[in-house]
Amino acid sequence: IWELKKDVYVVELDWYPDAPGEMVVLTCDTPEEDGITWTLDQSSEVLGSGKTLTIQVKEFGDAGQYTCHKGGEVLSHSLLLLHKKEDGIWSTDILKDQKEPKNKTFLRCEAKNYSGRFTCWWLTTISTDLTFSVKSSRGSSDPQGVTCGAATLSAERVRGDNKEYEYSVECQEDSACPAAEESLPIEVMVDAVHKLKYENYTSSFFIRDIIKPDPPKNLQLKPLKNSRQVEVSWEYPDTWSTPHSYFSLTFCVQVQGKSKREKKDRVFTDKTSATVICRKNASISVRAQDRYYSSSWSEWASVPCS
Amino acid sequence: RNLPVATPDPGMFPCLHHSQNLLRAVSNMLQKARQTLEFYPCTSEEIDHEDITKDKTSTVEACLPLELTKNESCLNSRETSFITNGSCLASRKTSFMMALCLSSIYEDLKMYQVEFKTMNAKLLMDPKRQIFLDQNMLAVIDELMQALNFNSETVPQKSSLEEPDFYKTKIKLCILLHAFRIRAVTIDRVMSYLNAS
């Protein structure tokens, strides 16, 4: 058993049929010595008396808010949560496996630049009685500071018969140099509590590997005389690291109709303009990627050919 | 400890082309190592990230773009003194700081070159003959060093009398290649910045 936060404790249980469970001793936070009784949740049934209560925690029915009273007055609470271990593996029931970039990916993180700011998100089908707490650091043995905000519900989607909820959190490394060469990864830890179930999820990464620039901005077209060719120009996104001559981007320019199966014109360039062939009912799209370290491409920025 | 935005002569930078070749060569070599050593811990997640130049050179700090010198977190206290005569410095206006930066890059290359050559000598003794260093990568390191053209004491190649542990050597190769790729990215960024300045 360990303390998650004040008056909230996590009991780690090997979860299998007829498991013996864990013996837990609860102590009432009071100077009083006698006349103390214990109850669980809203029940008025007295579970025991005395300053300490010894319980055998085997299942979710044994978890919950234990309260010690004296003469009708509440003295203190202890909330017990369960953390299940099945076949030596901690349970991952609360969050959905996003399977990208590999199986057992519960947390996904992205950074728009090298400033040390990044966003992580996760998915769940659970809509109520759910709380998250996020901590992060650079390295684990001698951790350096990363400050994370509160996790918030950022999107709701309907997937088949059930709803899917996306939560996200923003974090900022306390003293980040955009030009630094990372040798210690960022560690992100998410504590998830659903009703009386506790789970924790972790992710470890280098900022350089989670870079995904914003799309290029200010796309403009200029038709070329006596030709089907069009000059398309754009600018670096505002959120990208500066100076741009140091943090350079490379671009992919594509002309395509509405369907992905349609024919297309595609060219890669390090410049902020390119010449392509425009077709009726097609769109010109441009996306960006770090020129020197190939992490993710940005989403497309698009303008219609016409 | 930073690069002032000098205005060098147009086309001053023969090093830009070489640095692009360097990044390409080390990335290809790393990819080859990952594929060939698929049953060894050779991915970014599996290896320890070591920097053989740590406390010996200060490339990131010495080559910091002017715009980042206002960022307290970028101004590390590591200082190293270097020789200052390089052929990439085609402009008389080139500052002492730029020379310091390029000479730091030269020292990095020299250190990695020695490590890679020592390692290759060991890998050539491996009866499995599983992986060797790409001669193109070694040649590209040499070309960039020549373009930088700094006078420097030659570092003797490390020779070892004991029987090499080939497993450890291959893991060390992965560690070195990952670190060298990161440094090659920095070098490319620096050359691009200097070329644009």
């Epitope: 199966r261 024919k263 890669f268 390090d270 062939i277 077709r279 | -």
Partner: antibody
Framework: QVQLVQSGAEVKKPGSSVKVSCKAS????????LHWVRQAPGQGLEWMGW????????EYAPKFQGRVTITADESTSTAYMELSSLRSEDTAVYYC???????????LGQGTLVTVSS | DIVMTQSPLSLPVTPGEPASISCRAS??????LHWYQQKPGQAPRLLIA???QSISGVPSRFSGSGSGTDFTLTISSLQPEDFATYLC?????????FGQGTKVEIK
Amino acid sequence: QVQLVQSGAEVKKPGSSVKVSCKASGGTFSDYYLHWVRQAPGQGLEWMGWIDPENGDTEYAPKFQGRVTITADESTSTAYMELSSLRSEDTAVYYCARNKELRYFDVLGQGTLVTVSS
Amino acid sequence: DIVMTQSPLSLPVTPGEPASISCRASQSISINLHWYQQKPGQAPRLLIAFASQSISGVPSRFSGSGSGTDFTLTISSLQPEDFATYLCQQSNSFPLTFGQGTKVEIK
């Protein structure tokens, strides 16, 4: 299986014209760009131009501008390349090529040898 | 027009050995470079698109690298069927242009 089948070899006199055909099978004809490239004996490839069969749009290499005409007939899934004012240096194997991507070729025809000789 | 220069023009290789072919552009073309294989009397066949993207059905021993002006096609271990002429093509701008070809011959 996508195939491009070209018309047979031709022998032409200098100053005349030649029209080579390229019949596509497999896949929708208008879903692809169609190009013509040529290869003189012992030489590399030379790009001549492309057509978008969907709308008839064409683009020609400046070297052939005014001398080459590329057309397409959607009803027969056939593209044509006509080269006029032939000279001896036009002796080459002419290939049609296609792709959904405009700027390179994933399938090429078997080639048509055009010999220009007096 | 962008001029593509291949080297060497002829490359004698022992079967089972690796081979590398170089292609250089007269100006920077990013990764807009494609490789083809051509056997005598046959049409060219696409091997690699955009400098390094493998093409379905092409053996994995063929790989490409490079960007800007310098590109390389590598055959990790030459098989008897790989003895042919290899061509590079730029797609950075029209007119599309090709290298003059590198003939890989049996040593």
